[in-house]
């Protein structure tokens, strides 16, 4: 048993030009999350597989929001460390999978809403009991910076910890054929209990008289390896004294997979493929449970209808994947009609309509003019899903409730003065001009270009425009 | 400067075994993490992977292929040995050596360096 | 055996233009591989673990993708940028390629 560890240094911009947007504003300040999830071997599962070897959650962060006009500067972190117990030994090779999250904080109704901002995996080897392992992982335009150990748990030791630890029974040395534990000189190594012959160094027991192997051995005492590397002849026979299997047969020969599993070649060692409600290098391990909390995103644990699914998780809206872990964008889908804008909240979708519709999707046009006045004997015209009020001459603005002033945009041309009227504008039209606006110059002869002056009216004569 | 070079015979016969060498420099096979794998081409179509070989003697074949592949490695000579037997014409291809490089000892990082080819013509 | 299908198999486009390539498997894949190759040269790789830029690569090209869909961006395109493209992954044997995607000048 133990504790994997890891810390975030920080998480921000990567190197190199098209910066990322800060995921916060002012309008909508963020604070951010991390979720660890490790699984045994160095499977390449997807990412919604259990996390066999355990998950864990950070605390929140700070809440931050953005300087306008700042670049996104690395994002404050949460405090402490994510901490993820083993039950089991140690595997010596895992995968890794840390999710940055954001939570908006800003004026959602019903609470925060999550997203997932970026999401990167390894896979690594690591013994238990080392120093820290420092890491740089890209996702997109961000960068997380973070260290990671693996520590056993008293009163395990070893790279695997698997070796238990006592305290002394006397004080001056440790008993026959038995070694201190370093580094606590202060305790011995508990008596061997695994089958004899057991290999130390790749197999290991947490049952008396069992022999259970690390990754990359096999046998019944861990002693052969699953690679070929050790054999030096290329087609030569088995080896008995490295312990060294047949070149020419692939890893995937004999099917090291358990519980159904199907085998694939890797380009350096093998993968099993688990059926549901197994994991594990050879799909040996079964039984994640609701205990385990595998639902993310408040999804409902319940167990499994059937032997092979040990659990199901129950996504609330807004999340899928087996393990609730993905944010489903349900704005792709474009539910909202008639150019409304797509919110989605998390707990619910909203549309924002545009100006002459309504309803949960935008599906209604209103009726424009209905309960709409246009004052001063304006008449209302419906259109483009916004009421307009066509004015009476004299009066403007939306709702014709402003007094025009008819000369103010200079309608007399070539010098003609403008008088308002009560039913609009009259032109006063400078010597040689005509019209209702003196467009017109007058011919030398008297007689116009274009079409007569109306009866009654001579040249020159104020014209009032209609 | 890191360079691969293929070199073997243009031509082969069917039913013939086509031995085809890769010579490297720039980089050790005794270095950990690194291996060397071949690719053809036939011509007008797409690559095809046909085996690789690593540092510590790990080897991978192509299944469709794996009973007519050998791949083997001269660390001192800086080779890597690539033989086909039993040649037919479809076999015709340019064929690659590549240079593979290997993260945490475990999984492809890239194929980073390539031979400039050799074109093997299989006829009678 | 994991299928890579690229698409296009072949595009025109302009010097200057944005064009995206894409390759999808048959089964998931933890990354993508992507290689450019040149009438008689030998390919050349230009992305690897999906989104890493090789060594001399020029930042207009980018990749990206997860799970059986990933996606080759090359942002302006350059005369020199005419060529077929191909994909690989890395995750079971065959290590198979995609068919190529032949990138032509318009």
């Known amino acids: 048993a133990g504790v994997f560890e890891l810390q975030i240094h920080s998480f921000g911009p990567g190197p190199g030009p098209g910066a990322p947007r800060s995921p916060c504003s002012a309008r909508l300040p963020c604070r951010l999350f991390f979720r660890v999830c490790l699984k045994p071997g160095l499977s390449e599962e997807a990412a919604e597989s259990p996390c066999a070897l355990g998950a864990a959650l950070s605390a929140r962060g700070p809440v931050y929001t953005e300087q306008p006009g700042a670049p996104a500067p690395d994002l404050p972190l949460p405090d402490g460390l994510l901490q993820v117990p083993f039950r089991d030994a140690w595997p010596g090779t895992f995968s890794f999978i840390i999710e940055t999250w954001r939570e908006e904080l800003g004026d959602q109704i019903g609470g925060p809403a999550w997203s997932l901002l970026a999401r990167v995996a390894g896979r690594r080897r690591l013994a238990a009991g080392g120093p820290w392992a420092r890491d740089i992982q890209r996702a997109g335009a961000w960068e997380l910076r973070f260290s990671y150990r693996a520590r056993c748990e008293p009163p395990a030791v070893g790279t695997a910890c698997t070796r238990l630890c006592r305290p002394r029974s006397a004080p001056s040395r440790c008993g026959p054929g038995l070694r201190p534990c370093a580094p606590l000189e202060d305790e011995c190594e508990a008596p061997l209990v695994c089958r004899a012959g057991c290999s130390p160094e790749h197999g290991f027991c947490e049952q008396p008289g069992e022999c259970r192997c690390l990754e990359g051995w096999t046998g019944p005492l861990c002693t052969v390896p699953v690679s070929t590397s050790s054999c030096l002849s290329p087609r030569g026979p088995s080896s008995a004294t490295t312990g060294c299997l047949v070149p020419g047969p692939g890893p995937c020969d004999g099917n090291p997979c358990a519980n159904g599993g199907s085998c694939s070649e890797t380009p350096r060692s093998f993968e099993c493929t688990c059926p549901r409600g197994f994991y594990g290098l050879r799909c040996e391990v079964s039984g994640v449970t609701c205990a385990d909390g595998p639902c993310f995103n408040g999804g409902l644990c319940v167990g499994g209808a059937d032997p092979d699914s040990a659990y199901i998780c129950h996504c609330p809206p807004g999340f899928q994947g087996s393990n609730c872990e993905k944010r489903v964008d349900r704005c792709s889908l474009q539910p909202c009609r008639n150019g409304g804008l797509c919110l989605d909240l998390g707990h619910a979708l909203r549309c924002r309509c545009r100006a002459g519709f309504a309803g949960p999707r935008c599906e209604h046009d209103l009726d424009d003019c209905a309960g709409r006045a246009c004052a001063n004997g304006g008449t209302c015209v419906e259109g483009g899903g916004a009421h307009r009020c066509s004015c009476a001459l004299g009066f403007g603005g939306r709702d014709c409730r402003e007094r025009a002033d008819p000369c103010a945009a200079r309608p007399c041309a070539h010098g003609g003065r403008c008088y308002a009227h009560f039913s609009g504008l009259v032109c006063a039209c400078a010597p040689g001009y005509m019209g209702a606006r003196c467009e017109f110059p007058v011919h030398p002869d008297g007689a116009s270009a274009l079409p007569a002056a109306p009866p009654g009216l001579r040249p020159g004569d104020p014209q009032r425009y209609l | 400067q890191i360079t691969l070079k293929e070199s073997g015979p243009t031509l082969v016969k069917p039913t013939q075994t086509l031995t085809l060498t890769c010579t490297f420099s720039?980089?050790?096979?005794?270095?950990?993490?690194?291996?060397v794998g071949w690719i053809r081409q036939p011509p007008g179509k797409a690559l095809e992977w046909l085996a690789h070989?690593?540092?510590?003697?790990?080897?991978r074949y192509s299944p469709s292929l794996k009973s007519r592949l050998t791949i083997t490695k001269d660390t001192s000579k800086n080779q890597v040995v690539l033989t086909m037997t039993n040649m037919d014409p479809v076999d015709t291809a340019t064929y690659y050596c590549?240079?593979?490089?290997?993260?945490?000892?475990?999984?492809?990082?890239?194929?980073?360096?390539w031979g400039q080819g050799t074109l093997v013509t299989v006829s009678s | 055996d994991i299928q890579m299908t690229q698409s296009p198999s072949s595009l025109s486009a302009s010097v200057g233009d944005r064009v995206t390539i894409t390759c999808s498997a048959s089964?998931?894949?933890?990354?993508m591989y992507w290689y450019q190759q040149k009438p008689g040269k030998a390919p050349k790789l230009l992305i690897y673990?999906?989104?890493n830029l090789a060594s001399g690569v020029p930042s207009r090209f980018s990749g990206s993708g997860s799970g059986t869909d990933f996606t080759l961006t090359i942002s302006s395109l350059q005369p020199e940028d005419f060529a077929t493209y191909y994909c690989?992954?890395?995750?079971?044997?065959?290590?198979?390629f995609g068919q190529g995607t032949k990138l032509e000048i318009k």
């Open positions: 590549a240079r593979i490089v290997s993260f945490d000892n475990d999984h492809v990082s890239a194929m980073d360096y």
């Open positions: 089964s998931s894949v933890s990354y």
């Open positions: 720039g980089f050790s096979l005794s270095t950990s993490g690194m291996g």
């Open positions: 673990l999906t989104s």
């Open positions: 070989i690593w540092w510590d003697d790990v080897k």
């Open positions: 690989q992954q890395w995750r079971s044997n065959p290590f198979t």
